[in-house]
Interface confidence: low
């Protein structure tokens, strides 16, 4: 029988009751139109909805939109457009959340075409109060706030200058133009790109990466015949046109632009992008495209400075047309990531890697599935999940997978068992011990989300029907109750709960149709008195992450040690609560090749550990590029996995020498880098 | 061994209705899609209907909707396709498939249902 | 909905020939794509899955090939029982379906 329908299940005492006592309607006075909501601040119970309504007239669109206003996580709303002098606010730009705890939200409004510049509502105390503020500039992008600064503000205009505010938009200086992109670094530091010759598309591959880092009085340009750059971790990367034809490369900089090194990946044609899929203060992971419009490319891992990289994974699914890919950061278990595959016969595969991108392997196959008409063999197969590109081809997959560093090993997706993602409907899948294992949790597409740490799961199934009710889950995902929660069904447009997955609060949003009207309407369902008590010690118990093989004394270990956690059992239904903290105990594990990536110049052979010189460089001098110098590497063809903490064991030596020999790989050598001051 | 066994075929006046039925064996049921396929006679194949694993999804071609219904009994093994205001062109063989994903992939004999007064 | 078109729609071979049937789409169904075998009086038979994989119990001497629109299912080297219709189906996004409208094989 489906999981949630056998007679094991223990049912969740008086829940109809305890869940109807719990449930908040809210009715919004709009047609229906669009809807934006925003969470402000964390554990504040503040929710920002802006619903706007644009009614086509002859000759132009009239637009409406009103601003409501909660402080009990979406139970009750206040009609708050007064308070933005009832404004029409522009949706494209959505709320400007500032960062942290700060209470601070900016909203852009629409203006008249004639209009000298643009306006904002800013609030600083949680949307209790706006300022109405008019720029002198029309904006073109979203106000943008400094990570440590949230006083500090950029914005680009519409003709292209760089504007910087420092007291929370009260006050504009433009302190650059012919701004192509800009970005917030650390310290309160400012990347951007300038083009000279006319706009940011005749210049691409003949830009200036630029960096301040006080806020406009002084400048410094730190490298030249830009394409583009990004920032990733401690990492500032950026992909320079080379001398002599069209190509271009990464080059990598840790120090914030002063000094930069190649990294050792292929260079790409005008056709063809670099994307860093995830980075940390470790390492790296970059997608490198295939010549031709293959749809696929190669994924690279970077060692501790971002140079030296390792073939990760080849023909990975990312998609030039539309720019997909389903690369995701499993974030509730350390080291996981998934991804997607084009094999050669154009079928498209999940693979999965539980060490940072060392080795990927397929998902098992849920034990209670069977595979589908895609597998070769029916008795061997694989989990295949839905991700960003599936969604992408308007398959019938509401949601991408989900996980969160709270719900240790807790990871949701849909997906299809075979030998490759199958077109038909998809099913939801969990995984409670992130990702090497999976069940079968809920039969077709749904809606979901992870509330209370995981002491709860809900979901709403993806129907064209109305629906009215809700399905929950207190033991991750094995037994379901469902809950109606109102009598005249809606049509569902989305689920809404707190970042962070602490809280008990739901919000189904979705809108009423009657003959005349349509109405946006929310039913917030607070699960608390669902789990009565606090969880206490015994309720949980001690979980190794990782573990595959409790016979051997290294079980667990993965980039260099183990980690011990305190999880919920599944029985136990009680509350983890606001405040829960995960418990882990790590311990170190030994040195095995397994915590050595392949050094510059070699690789690993399949389902080999050891690292082999490459043929093609056997007896040649490894000469390379670092911070504008030559160096010279002898090695035996190992280096430490970034992040890697293992001690003892095997310990591969290397040693880099300076060849005091300049290579700019026609960067800007540091010596040679202009500054100015305004 | 996987088996599909049709039944319900038969004779019907034009308007009439009919219940198909499609008895499942030698393999898991309800972990598996299903599907009636239809082939009037010399004539190539036409789908019919699609029901997921657990019956929560139904799938039909438009010129079929709101005439045919598919549904399955898991306790059962069983498939069922309900006809209504049948008409001389709805006259073929009907076979229930085992629908995993990309592929039908096993079939019934097939069961003739014939419309004609 | 995706248009099949299936050629030829008939075809007269020798044993030992070389057969190949094709399938065109009017869009693009990324492999999505079942070859089936029926002989007269008898029930659909699965003979290729996914474009190019060959099912469970299908001689070797058939094998699928194709992506994007254009799909061909070839017989290396014919044998008597392979004289049937032949039918292609897509499986890509939403219903319908849509089956090709068959090939006859036929004997020289």
């Known amino acids: 029988s489906a999981p949630g329908e056998d007679e094991e299940c223990g049912r969740v005492r008086d829940f109809v009751a305890k869940l109807a006592n719990n449930t908040h309607q809210h009715v919004f006075d709009d047609l229906r139109g669009s809807v934006s909501l925003s969470w402000v601040g964390d554990s504040t119970g503040v929710i920002l909805v802006l619903t706007t309504f644009h009614v086509p007239l002859v000759i132009m669109t009239f637009g409406q939109s009103k601003l409501y206003r909660s402080e009990d996580y979406g139970k009750n709303f206040k009609d708050i457009t007064d308070l933005i002098n009832n404004t029409f606010i522009r949706t494209e730009f959505g709320m400007a959340i500032g960062p942290e705890n700060s209470g601070k939200v900016v909203l852009t409004a629409e203006v008249s075409g004639g209009s000298r510049g643009g306006r904002i509502f800013r609030s600083s105390d949680f949307a209790k109060n706006f300022v109405q503020t008019d720029l002198p500039f029309h904006p073109l992008t979203q106000m943008m706030y400094s990570p440590q600064n949230s006083d500090y503000l950029l914005a680009l205009s519409t003709e292209n200058g760089l504007w910087v505010s420092k007291n929370f938009g009260g006050k504009w200086e433009e302190i650059h133009k012919a701004v192509c992109l800009a970005k917030w670094g650390s310290d309160n530091t400012i990347f951007f790109t300038t083009y000279a010759n006319g706009s940011c598309k005749a210049d691409l591959g003949a830009l200036e990466l630029w960096r301040t880092s006080d806020l406009g009085k002084s400048f410094k340009t730190i490298g030249v015949k830009i394409y583009s750059f990004g920032l990733g971790g401690r990492f500032l990367f950026a992909s320079v046109m080379a001398d002599k034809d069209t190509t271009r490369r990464i080059h990598v900089s840790t120090d914030q632009g002063d000094t930069w090194s190649m990294a050792q990946l292929p260079s790409v044609g005008q056709e063809q992008f670099y994307s860093i899929l995830a980075a940390n203060d470790d390492m790296v992971f970059m997608h490198v495209d295939e010549p031709g419009d293959t749809g696929f490319g190669t994924i690279f891992t970077s060692d501790d400075r971002g140079i030296v990289y390792s073939k990760s994974l080849d023909r990975h699914l990312y998609t030039t047309t539309g720019g997909e890919t389903d690369f995701t950061n499993v974030t509730s278990l350390r080291g996981v990531y998934i991804t997607s595959v084009l094999s050669e016969d154009n079928s498209i595969q999940t693979m999965i890697t539980f060490d940072q991108g060392g080795r990927w392997t397929h998902l098992r196959k849920p034990e209670n599935s069977e595979c589908d008409a895609t597998a070769k063999n029916k008795n061997e197969c694989s989990l295949h999940i839905h991700a960003s590109y599936s969604i992408s081809q308007k398959l019938n997959v509401p949601m991408a997978p989900l996980s969160e560093p709270n719900a240790v090993g807790i990871v949701i997706a849909h997906g299809s068992v075979g030998d490759a993602i199958s077109v038909m409907v998809p099913d939801v899948y969990i995984s409670d011990d992130g990702g090497y294992s999976w069940t079968k949790m809920l039969e077709g597409p749904h809606y979901y989300t992870i509330l209370d740490s995981g002491g709860i799961i809900v979901a709403i199934e993806h129907s064209s029907r109305p629906i009215n009710v809700i399905k929950f889950s207190t033991d991750e995902g094995q037994c379901w109750q469902t809950y109606t929660f109102t009598r005249d069904p809606i049509y569902f447009t989305g689920l809404a709960s707190e970042p962070g997955a602490r809280s008990m609060n739901i919000s189904i949003w979705g809108f009423t149709e009657s003959f005349l009207t349509s109405q946006w309407v929310s039913y917030t369902i607070d699960f608390k008195d669902i789990l009565e008590r606090n969880c206490e010690e015994k309720d949980y118990t001690i979980w190794l992450a990782h573990s595959t093989d409790p016979e051997d004394y290294e079980d667990g270990c993965i980039l260099g040690y183990k980690e011990q956690f305190l999880r919920l059992r599944k029985s136990s239904v009680c509350q983890n609560g606001r405040d829960y903290v995960v418990t882990k105990q790590p311990s170190i594990c030994l040195c095995s090749l397994e915590d050595f990536l392949c050094d510059f110049g070699y690789y690993r052979p399949e389902n080999d550990s050891k690292c082999v010189e490459q043929p093609e460089l056997k007896g040649h001098d490894l000469e390379f590029c670092l911070y504008g110098r030559e160096e010279h590497l002898t090695t035996n063809g190992y280096r430490k996995i970034p992040g890697d903490k293992c001690q003892g064991g095997v310990n591969p030596v290397r040693e880099v020498k300076d060849l005091k020999k300049k290579c700019t790989s026609n960067f800007l050598s540091p010596e040679k880098q202009n500054s100015k001051s305004n | 061994e996987v088996q599909l066994v049709e039944s319900g075929g038969g004779l019907v006046q034009p308007g009439g209705s009919l219940r198909l039925s499609c008895a499942a064996s030698g393999f898991t049921f309800n972990i598996y899609g299903m599907s009636w396929v239809r082939q009037a006679p010399g004539k190539g194949l036409e789908w019919v209907a699609t029901?997921?694993?657990?019956?929560?999804?139904?799938y039909y071609p438009d010129i079929l909707k709101g005439r045919f219904t598919i549904s399955r009994d898991n306790a059962k093994n069983s498939l069922y396709g309900q006809m209504n205001s049948l008409r001389a062109e709805d006259t073929a063989v009907y076979y229930c498939?085992?629908?995993?994903?990309?592929?039908?992939?096993?079939w019934g004999q097939g069961t003739l249902v014939t419309v004609s007064s | 909905d995706i248009q099949m078109t299936q050629s030829p729609s008939s075809l007269s071979a020798s044993v030992g020939d070389r057969v190949t049937i094709t399938c065109r789409v009017s869009e693009n169904i990324y492999s999505n794509l079942a070859w089936y075998q029926q002989k007269p009086g008898k029930s659909p038979k699965l003979l290729v899955y996914?474009?190019?994989n060959i099912a469970d119990g299908v001689p070797s001497r058939f094998s699928g090939s194709g992506s994007g629109t254009d799909y061909t299912l070839t017989i290396s080297s014919l044998q008597p029982e392979d004289f049937a219709t032949y039918y292609c189906?897509?499986?890509?996004?939403?219903?319908?379906?849509?089956f090709g409208q068959g090939t006859k094989l036929e004997i020289k």
């Open positions: 498939a085992r629908h995993p994903g990309g592929a039908m992939d096993y």
């Open positions: 029901i997921s694993s657990g019956g929560i999804y139904t």
């Open positions: 189906q897509h499986f890509w996004g939403t219903p319908p379906w849509t």
């Open positions: 996914a474009a190019t």
